[in-house]
């Protein structure tokens, strides 16, 4: 079993090519069967927050040295382990560095933590679409279209945890014009920056832009939900998709209104108001607990529109996972 693990070649210590240490020697891991559950364990072991992807290890520079060995053929984690060493492993059979595994974690230490403070998309439907605004010295500023690119939009979407950029180079509708000072123009992002503030740009506040040139960005925001473990799609333990990872919802404050929003969103009719005992028959989940203290009015069309703690922040165990039973 490996005695150490690290990620090499990424923008920060929480992404990169996976390397493990065996008998004092660092080597790579083959990507046979490498999946998000394996990455989740690795991220947990490194104190890097939630798993966000399983990129190929060859994306990270510099590549593994020819002399460096591939040490592990396959890792099979359930997703609940604390370290990679606790997962089933196969020593290497046949693998080249072209098949090195990679991992990407949220990296809670970075400036694009689950609650980024330096950038927002304002006046849009949800937090993943809107007018780009950047915070500087406690003041929110808009960003001029001049020099804006898809690469810059990618940085914003990643910084907000909103998936890939799907729309940029769009000017705001009149009702969405900013009223803030115009921050800057001539953004020059490579697309690999951790935050928009890391991109080179023109001087702060010095530009000839108008608010009708404010930048509007739309990100994928791949929020989804499902009910698992039931006899049909309309009953079971509730799981929500955030940043490409499925996780459960804690039952703190959960009630009838929250049930109704879930059933509505899934097109599953009305909530059958199950008893506490009925809710528990779907068992505990594994992996992430994404939401806690969800509060809905009952009028929302999506659970995402309800109030809740920041994604991934909770004081729950999987014994408190929410289950919902709808009329179907």
């Amino acid at each position: 079993s490996p005695s150490g693990v690290r990620l090499v070649g990424g923008l920060h210590r929480c992404e990169g090519r996976v390397e493990v240490e065996q008998k004092g020697q660092w080597g790579t891991v083959c990507d046979d069967g490498w999946d998000i559950k394996d990455v989740a364990v690795l991220c947990r072991e490194l104190g890097c927050g939630a798993a966000s992807g399983t990129p190929s290890g060859i994306l990270y520079e510099p590549p593994a040295e020819k002399e460096q060995k591939v040490l592990i053929q396959s890792v099979s984690c359930t997703g609940t382990e604390d370290t990679l060493a606790q997962c089933e492993q196969e020593e290497v059979y046949d693998c080249s560095h072209d098949e090195d595994a990679g991992a990407s974690c949220e990296n809670p230490e970075s400036s694009f933590s689950p609650v980024p403070e330096g950038v927002r998309l304002a006046d849009g439907p949800g937090h993943c679409k809107g007018r780009v605004e950047v915070k500087h010295q406690n003041q929110w500023y808009t960003v001029c279209q001049t020099g804006w690119s898809l690469r810059a939009a990618k940085v914003v979407c990643r910084q907000l945890g909103c998936g890939r950029a799907v729309l940029t180079q769009k000017r705001c509708n009149k009702h969405a014009y900013g009223r803030k000072p115009i921050w800057l123009s001539q953004m020059s992002c490579s697309g690999r920056e951790a935050t928009l503030q890391d991109c080179p740009s023109g001087p702060w506040g010095k530009n000839t832009c108008n608010h009708d040139e404010d930048t509007w960005v739309e990100c994928e925001d791949p929020f989804d939900l499902r009910l698992v473990g039931g006899d049909n799609l309309c009953s079971g333990r509730l799981e929500v998709l955030h940043k490409g990872v499925w996780g459960s919802v804690c039952d703190d404050n959960w009630g009838e209104k929250e049930d109704q929003v879930v059933c509505k969103q899934l097109g599953c009719g009305k909530s059958l108001s199950p008893s506490f005992r009925d809710r528990k028959c779907y068992g505990p989940g594994v992996g992430r607990i994404w939401l806690d203290n969800v509060r809905c009015s009952g009028e929302e069309q999506s659970l995402e529109q309800c109030q809740h703690r920041f994604w991934g922040f909770h004081d729950c165990t999987h014994q408190e996972d929410v289950a919902v039973i709808c009329s179907g």
């Epitope: 046979d32 069967g33 020819k66 591939v70 290497v92 059979y93 046949d94 693998c95 080249s96």
Partner: antibody, heavy 115, light 112 residues
Framework: QSVEESGGRLVTPGTPLTLTCTVS????????INWVRQAPGKGLEWIGM??????TYYASWAKGRFIISRTSSTTVDLKMTSPTIEDTATYFC???????????WGQGTLVTVSS | ELDLTQTPSSVSAAVGGTVTINCQSS????????LSWYQQKPGQPPKLLIY???ALASGVSSRFSGSGSGTEFTLTISDVQCDDAATYYC????????????FGGGTEVEIK
């Protein structure tokens, strides 16, 4: 990419024999090499392998009877320590793994053990 | 150690028909389904048809298909042609504190 077996011949029982697998276009530090045999008119039988990590593995019946070793960056040997008449077969050297699309086999080399 | 039991040991098929060959493993070949199928003709080395239980090897006709997982696997040859006359082997790769490979006993396919 190719693999080729050599060293097969007629030997008497108990006389050690070494077969050699020569590879070209393959980096043995990345790829495993297996030895498989096939007795006349019979099925395929896995003997053992040397992994890309330079570790050897054997079928339980083959332990002690065969020794696999990497002798250079392009050759892997199979030593038959004390052949018996039942070891008469065509011996194949091959790169394969059931989880991979690549499969590369030599034409085989015939070993006949007879007194 | 891994044991693979192949059935039937021989089968006769008409041109245009379908042949099904089964392979049962003594233990699961793991979550990655390390099982492949080979075709061998007399005097030739085996030729890979299917890997990872169901993936078609490069250059192999789509008339060949593989299915199954865990311990039960199947090779299906549809629209059988004269050129399909050969012996077919399943091959499994298994890990248990070490690597093991094994072959099934083979199925001889004869074309009527």
């Amino acid at each position: 990419q190719s693999v080729e077996e050599s060293g097969g011949r007629l030997v008497t029982p108990g006389t050690p024999l070494t077969l050699t697998c020569t590879v070209s276009g393959i980096d043995l530090s990345n790829y495993a090499i297996n030895w498989v045999r096939q007795a006349p008119g019979k099925g395929l039988e896995w003997i053992g392998m040397i992994s890309s990590g330079d570790v050897t593995y054997y079928a339980s019946w083959a332990k002690g009877r065969f020794i696999i070793s990497r002798t250079s960056s392009t050759t892997v040997d199979l030593k038959m320590t004390s052949p018996t008449i039942e070891d008469t077969a065509t011996y194949f050297c091959a790169r394969f793994f059931a989880g991979r699309s690549e499969s590369l086999w030599g034409q085989g080399t015939l070993v006949t053990v007879s007194s | 150690e891994l044991d693979l039991t192949q059935t039937p040991s021989s089968v006769s098929a008409a041109v245009g028909g379908t042949v099904t060959i089964n392979c049962q493993s003594s233990q699961s070949v793991n979550k990655n389904n390390y099982l492949s199928w080979y075709q061998q003709k007399p005097g030739q080395p085996p030729k890979l048809l299917i890997y990872s239980a169901s993936a078609l090897a490069s250059g192999v006709s789509s008339r060949f298909s593989g299915s199954g997982s865990g311990t039960e696997f199947t090779l299906t040859i549809s629209d059988v042609q004269c050129d399909d006359a050969a012996t077919y082997y399943c091959q499994g790769t298994y890990y248990d504190s070490g690597w093991y490979n094994a072959f099934g006993g083979g199925t001889e396919v004869e074309i009527k």
